[in-house]
């Protein structure tokens, strides 16, 4: 066979997609079906990952690389290499042990995954609430109350810009 042999370890010459059997004069045999070796010098091939059930195949396995999975619609990946699939919830909800639950008042979730997070406390930054929060959206903070003209509501969006001293028509 045509292959340069390493003086230290003949198996180091076996490329990805093959395995080296020490008992067989260091021949690089192809990985059997449904297995792979992604690096050279392997003495065994690894079984391909199967994307079954809630997992679906994002990238097919080959003799040189493992399959990659993602999740079927309605689920999202968790963990390294999408090791788990977690159920999606609607915006404004979070996943609990009992399923998807609406965010409690004062919290929001603008994604289909993750937990409900507290609305921003505008007053901590010396600002006022410009737009109220909802289950799906955080509050929008605006200028501090002192910056607002007398009588302006802190929860109404600012009126269109106009000349100072003029009343709206």
């Amino acid at each position: 066979f045509e292959r340069t042999r390493s003086l230290q370890d003949p198996c180091s010459n076996c490329p990805a997609g093959t395995f080296c059997d020490n008992n067989r004069n260091q021949i690089c045999s192809p990985c059997p079906p449904n297995s792979f070796s992604s690096a050279g010098g392997q003495r065994t091939c690894d079984i391909c990952r199967q994307c079954k059930g809630v997992f679906r195949t994002r990238k097919e396995c080959s003799s040189t690389s493992n399959a990659e999975c993602d999740c079927t619609p309605g689920f999202h990946c968790l963990g390294a290499g999408c090791s788990m699939c977690e159920q999606d919830c609607k915006q404004g909800q979070e996943l609990t042990k009992k399923g998807c639950k609406d965010c409690c008042f004062g919290t929001f979730n603008d994604q289909k995954r993750g937990i409900c997070r507290p609305w921003t406390n505008c007053s901590l930054d010396g600002k006022s609430v410009l737009v109220n929060g909802t289950k799906e959206r955080d509050v929008v903070c605006g200028p501090s109350p002192a910056d607002l003209s007398p009588g302006a509501s802190s929860v109404t969006p600012p009126a269109p810009a106009r000349e100072p001293g003029h009343s709206p028509q």
Partner: antibody
Framework: DVQLVESGGGLVQPGGSRKLSCAAS????????MHWVRQAPEKGLEWVAY????????YYADTVKGRFTISRDNPKNTLFLQMTSLRSEDTAMYYC???????WGQGTTLTVST | QIVLTQSPAIMSASLGEEITLTCSAT?????MHWSQQKSGTSPKLLIY???NLASGVPSRFSGSGSGTFYSLTISSVEAEDAADYYC?????????FGGGTKLEIK
């Protein structure tokens, strides 16, 4: 869908040369080693040659060593078998096969005869 | 090189019958693959690494064995199973095929 399509077969005189090609599609060709396997008329299967995904490892059956050369062009998704000093016993259907042996081409017929 | 001997060379079976094809190796091999070739078509992988069914292969096919002796069993033969069956090993160079078993349906 995975497809392997061989071409280049035909009638060749003894001592002549021929180059077979195999066009691959439907899978990541550069991620797989490839084989050539042949089948003489009314006979069994015989492994001919193997090339690894990156062409660094090549093996031949003793019956073709020194006469046949396996190669590949990964950007073009094509496998080749250059055959020289052909003999009548090389007459066969030639299949290109993915290294998992899970997909075979439809084959191309080589006839070596005067 | 490792020589694979298949027996019987020709087998005739009735519909619904259970049959076993065997493959004997001159030296121990790590595992065996089996392929099926119907008349006028390319071979198709049937069983890989001794006992794993290839994609789309009916569950009536099964494989077993180790070392120098391997077998392929069809639990209930159907008309579409008429074909040549080859064992092949890819662990010991040069890689080799058995001579094949032709299955005929009575």
């Amino acid at each position: 869908d995975v497809q392997l399509v061989e071409s280049g077969g035909g009638l060749v005189q003894p001592g002549g040369s021929r180059k077979l090609s195999c066009a691959a599609s439907g899978f990541s060709f550069s991620s797989f080693g490839m084989h050539w396997v042949r089948q003489a008329p009314e006979k069994g299967l015989e492994w001919v040659a193997y090339i690894s995904s990156g062409s660094s490892t090549i093996y031949y059956a003793d019956t073709v060593k020194g006469r046949f050369t396996i190669s590949r062009d990964n950007p073009k998704n094509t496998l080749f078998l250059q055959m020289t000093s052909l003999r009548s016993e090389d007459t066969a259907m030639y299949y290109c096969v993915r290294d998992w042996t899970d997909y075979w081409g439809q084959g191309t017929t080589l006839t070596v005869s005067t | 090189q490792i020589v694979l001997t298949q027996s019987p060379a020709i087998m005739s079976a009735s519909l619904g019958e259970e049959i076993t094809l065997t493959c004997s190796a001159t030296s121990s091999v790590s595992y065996m693959h089996w392929s099926q070739q119907k008349s006028g078509t390319s071979p198709k992988l049937l069983i890989y690494t001794t006992s794993n069914l290839a994609s789309g292969v009916p569950s009536r096919f099964s494989g077993s064995g180790s070392g120098t002796f391997y077998s392929l069993t069809i639990s209930s033969v159907e008309a579409e199973d008429a074909a040549d069956y080859y064992c092949h090993q890819w662990t010991t160079y040069p890689w080799t095929f058995g001579g094949g078993t032709k299955l005929e349906i009575k």
